[in-house]
Amino acid sequence: ARNGDHCPLGPGRCCRLHTVRASLEDLGWADWVLSPREVQVTMCIGACPSQFRAANMHAQIKTSLHRLKPDTVPAPCCVPASYNPMVLIQKTDTGVSLQTYDDLLAKDCHCI
Amino acid sequence: ARNGDHCPLGPGRCCRLHTVRASLEDLGWADWVLSPREVQVTMCIGACPSQFRAANMHAQIKTSLHRLKPDTVPAPCCVPASYNPMVLIQKTDTGVSLQTYDDLLAKDCHCI
């Protein structure tokens, strides 16, 4: 149940996909990844106001309880709904290999 | 990759399963759910310090980039890794039915 995609906080403030450019040094990968030297990391960032992109029933419950008990129950959180795979060229004990990572880059986002 | 389960912030402060008691009124379900009248909602609450229960590579990246750019990239978030199903007795147009919800109660938690 991907509820409302309209952000009541204003354009771009709610949970959505952002791209952050990161070097291998930034990621702490410089000692084992050969390429790419820079990664366009797609990640989910933004607020999750009431029912915005609610992933499921649990997210809807969380919204209701956060409204009642904001100090106890946090608001839903903006996280990946799915991922895009990425292939890296990496050093291994035996040499150099291509390795696919299925859970590295966010593809789209929801609130949970 | 369920990295470190040791919480560096002190016992119970990191991402884990909590139970919150909620009435149908609290949940906004009073008009369509007959039973149970009260739900023991299990949800994921707590901090996600570096590599604590990192769900996957994306969570590890997020930790690294949050450390570098805390104003741009949020820390990983404590969310359900899986769910326990729950059966509700609910009102329908045609009467009363039993309905299973697979995504209502968190079963365990991770950081993403």
Epitope: L34, S35, P36, L98 | -
Partner: antibody, heavy 120, light 107 residues
């Protein structure tokens, strides 16, 4: 624009060694690795190996292991491929091809090719 | 090594025709498949990467699809400049391997 310019055609005798160069321009040379691919006359494409232009790490096709060496000179933004103990079936057009900026295991752009003829 | 099998090996078509070339990998390669076009005496040119992403500057009549082991390159409306040989290439593991090529000829 991004360009890979290769050295000229070579004629070699069996048992000899050939060294083909590939000069890169239009991008930061050590940011993207380089593959070498060859194509025998009228045949398909055969990948020979890859070199990280950043670290110098290499991986070679099994059938060429021990005969091929790939190197780079970052000061001149040039990649080299040396093939030893040449045989007649090494006669081919040799291409350098940069890893694509979009996907490391796709190749773009390619050099214009260097024809190496092995003949006694 | 991962074997790449391309079919057909040649196809005769006319300008305006829709042409489909298939490529099969001997094992799953996720979506790490690239397509290249090669004209006689020229170097190959990247058309499609990651199975379906169109390389910058490539006309939109070219499209790619598939994942796992089965992939397709489609030319929606063949143009005179499209008569060439097309190769697929897997990029999931070393050694990189190419299909045998498909020659698109004028009917």
């Amino acid at each position: 624009q991004v360009q890979l310019v290769q050295s000229g055609a070579e004629v070699k005798k069996p048992g000899a060694t050939v060294k083909v160069s590939c000069k890169a321009s239009g991008y930061t040379f050590d940011s993207l690795g380089m593959s070498w691919v060859r194509q025998a006359p009228g045949q398909g494409l055969e990948w020979m190996g890859y070199i990280s232009t950043y670290s110098g790490d290499t991986v070679y096709a099994q059938k060429l292991q021990g005969r091929v060496t790939m190197t780079t000179d970052t000061s001149t933004s040039t990649a080299y491929m040396e093939l030893r103990s040449l045989r007649s079936d090494d006669t081919a057009v040799y291409y350098c091809a940069r890893e694509s900026g979009q996907q490391v295991s796709a190749l773009d752009p390619w050099g214009q090719g260097t024809l190496v003829t092995v003949s006694s | 090594d991962i074997q790449m099998t391309q079919s057909p090996s040649s196809v005769s078509a006319s300008v305006g025709d829709r042409v489909t070339i298939t490529c099969r990998a001997s094992q799953g390669i996720s979506r790490w498949l690239a397509w290249y076009q090669q004209k006689p005496g020229k170097a190959p040119k990247l058309l499609i990467y990651a199975a379906s992403s169109l390389q910058s500057g490539v006309p939109s009549r070219f499209s790619g699809s598939g994942s796992g082991t089965d992939f397709t390159l489609t030319i929606s409306s063949l143009q005179p400049e499209d008569f060439a040989t097309y190769y697929c290439q897997q990029g999931a593991s070393f050694p990189l391997t190419f299909g045998g090529g498909t020659k698109v000829e004028i009917k």
